[in-house]
Structure formats: structure tokens, C-alpha cells
Amino acid sequence: IVGGTNSSWGEWPWQVSLQVKLTAQRHLCGGSLIGHQWVLTAAHCFDGLPLQDVWRIYSGILNLSDITKDTPFSQIKEIIIHQNYKVSEGNHDIALIKLQAPLNYTEFQKPICLPSKGDTSTIYTNCWVTGWGFSKEKGEIQNILQKVNIPLVTNEECQKRYQDYKITQRMVCAGYKEGGKDACKGDSGGPLVCKHNGMWRLVGITSWGEGCARREQPGVYTKVAEYMDWILEKTQSSDGKAQMQSPA
């Protein structure tokens, strides 16, 4: 996160860290807890690393430096990458992770509400992006979970800024005209959440951007509302019943 500040314990209890253990262990992506046994993240996090057993998912944590060999983590039972995602394209950057064992909810570890299907009418004015990613383009992973308040921008405005790419209706953009605040490398897959009527909702999944926090280059996020059918289909067919945290 560029231009952010330290988060507090329990402030973003749905935020998880997706880490890979090969020779060493490192944080690669963020993710959002959406049910006892489900995490929503970006499909591109698994490019070149599709093997379930190399991944460790840490939930209910604030500081990555607090992780030791004794820190509990979740393992992956199943990775469900959107069927239309292609490594050679930037569309449908969304994936579900089914955990091997369900998590108990606590003050520091609980799910984020999902938006309503095709939610286009809600005007979100209080949106935040969180993650342990770089604090500048040529930076490094941060120890303490960072947060930053970023306004949504219209897809029309976003398309003007990214003429070489197609900004689809299944994407949502956020950023300041002057730059300075944005997600960055290592924040991929993490949440863009907005507070509406007193409730936090998962509006976007951190996907891509041209550099980080550059002027007139907003961050691009997978629009969760556009994938509600897919999310429900995959979680229901795997569970027999939905265990998602949907809005009231």
C-alpha cells in the first residue's frame, strides 16, 4: 500500500496473507475471508504456483514479523480459478480458495460481507484498500498491515487513463487524480472494501495498475458484484449449501 498508515488489531478481520513456502517462506498476495472455509483472492496470484501444498494462509494477524514456525496457518483444500481467466489476458482475475479446515470466527478473524449481485446503483463514498504490499514501486513487503482510503473512479474515467487496455464492467477502479495513494506489489488479491449504511462490503479484489500511486493511473480491481453468481455457484456446489457472508 502506497500512502497508507498502520492498521489496528481487528480493524480488517477478513484480511489474510497468502504465503508460499518453498526453500524460504514469503508473502505473495492478500485475500479476503468470506466464509468459515472460503477465501476470495486474485487468480493471477496462482500463475506459476498452482500447487496447493506450497501455500500457507495466515488469518487473524496484523504483523507479518510476528509469524514464527509455531504460528497456526490454514492449508488449501482446493483452488478454484475462474474458468475464463487466462494468463495471457487481464480479465476475470478472481479465484476462490477452499480451506482444508473451517476457521472459527473471532474478533480478529471474521468474514467480510459480499455485495448484492450486479450491484450498480450503490454509490460508495468510503472505500479502503488494505495489504502488506510495497509502500513504493521499488519497495518491499511491509510488516504491519497497511490501510489507505481511496475514492472510486468511474469506468469511463478509468478507461481514459488506460487507453491500451479494456476496462470492462467487471472491473472497478479507485485512485486519486494526483496519485500518491494506491495498492502495490504484494497487495494483489486483497480487499477493496467500502462502508455503506454502517456495513463493510467487499467491492473489489486488488488486481492491477500501471506502477503504483502514479498520477492519473488508478488502481484496477475485480468487481465482486459482477461475480456473485460464480461465487455462489462454486461455494454451494462444493459445500452443498452457501456459507457466505451476504449483506442483510
Epitope: V87, S88, D93, D164, K166, A183, G186
Partner: antibody, heavy 125, light 108 residues
Amino acid sequence: EVQLLESGGGLVQPGGSLRLSCAASGFTFSDYMMAWVRQAPGKGLEWVSSIVPSGGHTHYADSVKGRFTISRDNSKNTLYLQMNSLRAEDTAVYYCARVARGIAARSRTSYFDYWGQGTLVTVSS
Amino acid sequence: EIVLTQSPGTLSLSPGERATLSCRTSQFVNSNYLAWYQQKPGQAPRLLIYGASSRATGIPDRFSGSGSGTDFTLTISRLEPEDFAVYYCQQSSRTPWTFGQGTKVEIK
């Protein structure tokens, strides 16, 4: 199977014109940026031009700017390169290439993942 | 424009040997925009490595890419007879997209 098939090359006099075509198949053409890359005899590769999926935005190498025009017809799955005011130094094999633009580490990627077999353009009097 | 300089110009090696090809860029290049291609005489180039280190589909694991910033490397761990060809690095970080001049890997 992704296939790119160039046509339209040949011998042309300096100052003349030629239109190259590239017929694409095996993928959703309208989803991909496309490009032309050329290679003069015995020389290295040189990017010529690229065009976004919608066709609404193009890029050119300085060496061809104002003389060459890239375009596409998504309904026909075809990429074009209109070459005007041709010079001897434009003599080359012209390749049509698909531009893959994925995502990695919260940034886009960009590379030529599929190439046609090339068509030879010879500019000589 | 970003200039890519490949070295050496020619690499004379025997099958089974290790080949190390260098590509230096005149400006910082985001590794996501650095690719390597192989070209054999009379053929179109073939993608080997994208994003500086990711192998393209169907490329044997003896090919590997590494590097960041302005220094990139293509390594062929054990040369097979079919690996003798010309190799190009390429950046698409900034237009004009540019290629290195190529490194020819020839049989010693």
C-alpha cells in the same frame, strides 16, 4: 490452436504502397492487442506497430510513423498494415504477432506469445 | 527509447554445456515487461520466457530467466542440439518496444 497467417508481401518500387493482412484463428481475436514486427535480411527484430483490441488506439515506431497505418477488423479476425511511401530500408520479413497482456504482481505483463510465419516485403527499383 | 544490449554477440558451446546470455537495458524495466525469444534460421521467433522469469507453455525447464531493473539473464542449463539458435530479449515497458541485437548460440 492459435494460428496467424500473413499475406500481401511482395516486390514494390520505392515510393510505392502495399497492404499486409494477417488472418487470425484459434482464439478470440477481439480480446487481444496485436502487433507487426519486422526483420531485415540478416538483421535483428524490430517492432513496427501495435493496436489495442478495440482498434481505437495505436502505436508506431518512429521509423514508420506517418507512412504506415495499422488497423483491424474484429468481425473478420484480421489485422492489417497499410504501408505507403515505401523505402529500401523497409525491406524485411513482416511478422504478425499476438500480444499477451496478463497480470503478475499487480502489474500488467506484455509479450508476443504467438507469431505468424512472416511475409517478405522487398522494396527495390 | 530503451536500448537493450545483449552479450556476448556469439556464444560457442558444446551440447551439454551451460549457456548464460545477458541483456542489459539502458533504463529501468519492470521485469513484467521483459521477454526472451528463440529464433532458428528461416523460422519465426518463439516465446521462451516472459515476465523475466516465467517459462512459456511447452518450454523445457532447462531454460530459465532471471534478473530485474536493468540486468537480465537467460540461462540454458544443458544445451541440447535443438537449442543452437539466435536469442533475443525484448522490452514492452515503454514504447517504442525494443529488442536486443541478439545472441547467437553456435556449436563449438
